[in-house]
Structures are given as structure tokens and as C-alpha cells.
């Protein structure tokens, strides 16, 4: 089948990193500088992405694969493929239109990005607060008050800090 396809379409023999050059009797020519082809049989090479300014090059462009950008230090990527860069804040802060602001009481942010989120309400799970929350950390829920009464046979180990649901980037 491969041989039949090759007879029908000479371009199918051109490997990644080359293109089928119509101007040169359909021979396989290398991709020009700053371009690539990641699959065989391509009639053109794609322009490489350029990482400039707030973007920096995470992976250089090669003849067979595109460049990849990330953000310069102090910034983090937004969007698939890092299409935008947003300023980092400190843990215990969130980015607002007026810059990085501390989390309000009762909320926390344990990352350099994203928004402040409410502390876990331990009582909703019938538990008590074992460790108080801070701007940087969620509360740690412990055993329920009933479990701590005299004569209780066992103590439930503290539950790990619950990560509130957030959509992946």
C-alpha cells in the first residue's frame, strides 16, 4: 500500500523536516530557517512561533517541531500553549485590577496565581477545626467534637486540607 501511495503521490515520501517543493519538480526540500514540518508529506513548512517580550523560549524551534514559550520569571501562563502571561502574586494574595492584594479574612491562596478561596467549613462535615486557617493555608479539620469526648475509643486522624475544586488550566 505504501508503495502504491508513493507512486500516486511523490510527496508522501517527504519526511518531517522537509516539504514537497512544487517549484522543484516535487522533490523534498528542507524546511527554510524559522519553519518546521512535524509530519511527512507536507507541501509547506509552518512558521515557527516566536517567544519575545514577556514570553521566553522554553523549547527552540527545530525543523521537525515548533518552538514552545513560557513566561518570564514573575509571570505564569494563561491559556493552552501559553497564549498570555499574568503577573505572579505571593501566597496569601490574589491579582486584582489594582495589583496583588492580600486575601480577605476567611479566605486563602496557597499559590502564586489564582484567586483567594474560602476556608473549608469543618462543621459541614461534622468535624472541628484542628489548625486555624491563614491567608496562605486552609484550615485543617480534625475529629468531630463527639470523638474527643472522654472514653472515646479511637481518634480519627486529621483529614488532609481539602483543595477546593478548580478547573485545570
Amino acid at each position: 500500500f505504501e508503495r502504491t501511495r508513493s507512486l500516486q503521490d511523490p510527496c508522501s515520501n517527504c519526511p518531517a523536516g522537509t516539504f514537497c517543493d512544487n517549484n522543484r519538480n516535487q522533490i523534498c526540500s528542507p524546511c527554510p530557517p524559522n519553519s518546521f514540518s512535524s509530519a511527512g508529506g507536507q507541501r509547506t513548512c509552518d512558521i515557527c512561533r516566536q517567544c519575545k517580550g514577556v514570553f521566553r523560549t522554553r523549547k527552540e524551534c527545530s525543523s521537525t517541531s515548533n518552538a514552545e514559550c513560557d513566561c518570564t520569571p514573575g509571570f505564569h501562563c494563561l491559556g493552552a500553549g501559553c497564549s498570555m502571561c499574568e503577573q505572579d502574586c505571593k501566597q496569601g494574595q490574589e491579582l486584582t485590577k489594582k495589583g496583588c492584594k492580600d486575601c480577605c479574612f476567611g479566605t486563602f491562596n496557597d499559590q502564586k496565581r489564582g484567586i483567594c478561596r474560602p476556608w473549608t467549613n469543618c462543621s459541614l462535615d461534622g468535624k472541628s477545626v484542628l489548625v486555624n486557617g491563614t491567608k496562605e493555608r486552609d484550615v485543617v479539620c480534625g475529629p468531630s467534637p463527639a470523638d474527643l469526648s472522654p472514653g472515646a475509643s479511637s481518634v480519627t486522624p486529621p483529614a488532609p486540607a481539602r483543595e477546593p475544586g478548580h478547573s485545570p488550566q
Epitope: 509552518d46 512558521i47 512561533r49 516566536q50 494563561l78 498570555m84 502571561c85 499574568e86 495589583g99
Partner: antibody
């Protein structure tokens, strides 16, 4: 609050140099760069060039022989100089912060080239 | 340079209707396309970045899609304040370029 404001003479004579400044607040000039973009009356947007946070520049090849973008961190200002202007350079000129997608723009300033 | 071609040039619709704006790139630009809204006397306003990501504070009636060379901005239900000029722009390769714009007007 992030703010950018363009300023400069609204009227420039042909063959002279157009000089604009972009005064910024709410962010550091050593952290962010700035792009200059222009828009001819009733037309689309045209990227002129950019200065990056480290001070290096990139220019559109269409302007490269007559454009200079610079920064004065002590004044919180970026500047654009475009020499040998003609009537075709009449446009609204914008500066926009470099974040990868132009989320923050100045309000723009109209420059008319006429004798 | 990468050329972006927007269509239609003008779109006449009524409030409540759905608007579909197209942007075609002369080269593969991945998903590195943004959409902007511009009203008379104002600077462009970022709506969508990375082809499909709504920017902070943009209503969810605005959505973007596409990759490679074909991109679409959709406004699901037009509000009176949505009538404006819309531009696509590519941030993939320098020089950065923009489409010529689509004017969305009230029918």
C-alpha cells in the same frame, strides 16, 4: 490600577519627526514592556513595534528605517519617535502593555500630519 | 508577514440574534489569536485570547473557537452594547498583525 496614557503634539508637519510619550502607572517598567500600535482613521490596526522590559526593541519592517522606541524609567514613560512623516502617518497612536495579548491599552492620541 | 482576513466586512443583525464572525490566517498560527471589540473614540478591548479563552470580566455570551488558520468569534445573544467593530489579531509571529475588522451594526 493599570493605566497607560499617550501624549504629544496633535499636529506634525510633513518630513518632521512625530514624538509621542506613553506615561504608565500601576505597573513597573522594569517588569513589563510596551507595544506601539496605530490606526488610520476608519481603518484597521497596525503594529509599529515594541520595547521589552530589558530595554531591547523589535520593529515592524515597514517602519524600521524611521522608528525609535525608548524608555525612561525615572519618568515612568515610554516614547515613540517616527521620522520623515507624511500624510500617510496620520492616525490614532496607541501604546499597549506587553502581556502576550494586549489586555491593557492607552486611550490613544490622534496625530495629524499636515502643513 | 501573516495576513488575517476577516469576514464579513459588515454584519447587520438585531439584538437577541446570534453573531458569527470569521478570521482566516494566511499561515498556521496555532491558537495564538485574540479578538478585540472597539467602539467609536475608544481603544480596542480584549475579549478573547488564545483563540478560545474569555478575558477577565467578559460576558459568557462571547466565545471563540478555531486553530491553525480558521477562527470564529460567536456572540450568542446580541445585546445593544455589542454593536461595534471587532478585530482579530495574531500573537504568534512578528510582525504582529490584525485583521481589517468586522463592523457589527444594528439591523
Amino acid at each position: 490600577q493599570v493605566q497607560l496614557q499617550e501624549s504629544g503634539p496633535g499636529l506634525v508637519k510633513p518630513s518632521q519627526t512625530l514624538s509621542l510619550t506613553c506615561t504608565v502607572s500601576g505597573f513597573s517598567l522594569t517588569t513589563y514592556g510596551v507595544h506601539w500600535i496605530r490606526q488610520h482613521p476608519g481603518k484597521g490596526l497596525e503594529w509599529i513595534g515594541a520595547i521589552w522590559s530589558g530595554g531591547s526593541t523589535d520593529y515592524n519592517a515597514a517602519f524600521i528605517s524611521r522608528v525609535t522606541i525608548s524608555v525612561d524609567t525615572s519618568k515612568n514613560q515610554f516614547s515613540l519617535k517616527l521620522s520623515s512623516v507624511t500624510a500617510a502617518d496620520t492616525a490614532v497612536y496607541y501604546c499597549a502593555r506587553d502581556d502576550g495579548s494586549f489586555a491593557n491599552w492607552g486611550q490613544g492620541t490622534l496625530v495629524t500630519v499636515s502643513s | 508577514e501573516i495576513v488575517l482576513t476577516q469576514s464579513p466586512g459588515t454584519l447587520s443583525l438585531s439584538p437577541g440574534e446570534r453573531a458569527t464572525l470569521s478570521c482566516k490566517a494566511s499561515e498556521n498560527v496555532g491558537t495564538y489569536v485574540s479578538w478585540y471589540q472597539q467602539k467609536p473614540g475608544q481603544a480596542p478591548r480584549l475579549l478573547i485570547y488564545g483563540a478560545s479563552n474569555r478575558y477577565t470580566g467578559i460576558p459568557d455570551r462571547f466565545s471563540g473557537s478555531g486553530s491553525g488558520t480558521d477562527f470564529t468569534l460567536t456572540i450568542s445573544r446580541l445585546e445593544p452594547e455589542d454593536f461595534a467593530v471587532y478585530y482579530c489579531g495574531q500573537t504568534y509571529s512578528y510582525p504582529l498583525t490584525f485583521g481589517q475588522g468586522t463592523r457589527l451594526e444594528i439591523k
